[in-house]
């Protein structure tokens, strides 16, 4: 099976992973900040 030129990128999936990891990290940090805020408000 032959690939038409330029639909082929053998490394794009790696960037997608990095972006997903960064997004997950951002969400985790946001959740942590929200918990801290709730603790402060709770006090």
């Amino acid at each position: 099976s032959e690939e038409p030129p330029i639909s082929l990128d053998l490394t794009f999936h790696l960037l997608r992973e990095v972006l997903e990891m960064a997004r997950a990290e951002q969400l985790a940090q946001q959740a942590h900040s929200n918990r801290k805020l709730m603790e402060i408000i709770g006090k």
């Epitope: 330029i6 990128d9 999936h13 972006l19």
Partner: antibody, heavy 113, light 112 residues
């Protein structure tokens, strides 16, 4: 037809930095990743890292962090790799490779006093 | 880093012979997205590497059908059914499943 035209051979002194260019044509530059590979001693291949021209996102081989910096200039469809504080260990042929599929002709870098 | 081990390092052949090159990875190359990012390149003397086979068994555009790739997980093979003069050079396997991307040491296909 996809073409990657790299800058010419360089003879540089130890301690200096230099930039290699890779001009892309024949496809939409911002649609796919650009990889950079080092080949020393005519055989050994090492992946340096990649950049996505659309958003500037990069991934580096830990070994080359602090040694190589990848950038792009979208309007001229050109990718660049800057090599920092060169030593004799950096003497090699450097390739750009679009999507890890199409390769440039290589740029020979010789570091010598 | 994923270590790619190619055998043999040198492969003397006669034109018309079948040639087979093995590549083993130190960990599975099956990505979580279902793809296996194992590729084969040929570097002819004085030239850049050129992609032959991508994702284990797909021939890149313009690659003759005498080239075939197979394997899964950690064990892969490139076969050339009838070697022609233009096939001589150094063959590299490479993986782009894991960062950093890594290459085998190369197999030199040469005439006996």
């Amino acid at each position: 037809e996809v073409q990657l035209q790299q800058s010419g051979p360089e003879l540089v002194k130890p301690g200096v930095s230099m930039k290699i260019s890779c001009k892309a044509s024949g496809y939409s530059f911002t649609d796919s990743t650009m990889n950079w590979v080092k080949q020393s001693h005519g055989k050994n291949l090492e992946w340096i890292g990649l950049i996505h021209p659309d958003n500037g996102g990069t991934i580096y081989n830990q070994k080359f962090k602090g040694k190589a910096t990848l950038t792009v200039h979208k309007s001229s469809s050109t990718a660049y790799m800057e090599l920092l504080s060169l030593t004799s260990e950096d003497s090699a042929v450097y390739y750009c490779a679009n999507g890890f599929a199409y390769w440039g002709q290589g740029t020979l870098v010789t570091v010598s006093a | 880093d994923v270590v790619m081990t190619q055998t043999p390092l040198s492969l003397p052949v006669s034109l018309g012979d079948q040639a087979s090159i093995s590549c083993r990875s130190s960990q599975s190359l099956l990505h979580s997205n279902g793809n296996t990012y194992l590729h084969w390149y040929l570097q002819k003397p004085g030239q850049s590497p050129e992609l032959l086979i991508y994702k284990v068994s797909n021939r890149f555009s313009g690659v003759p059908d005498r080239f075939s790739g197979s394997g899964s997980g950690t064990d892969f093979t490139l076969k050339i059914s009838r070697v022609e003069a233009e096939d001589l050079g150094v063959y590299f396997c490479s993986q782009s499943t894991h960062v950093p991307l890594t290459f085998g040491a190369g197999t030199k296909l040469e005439l006996k």
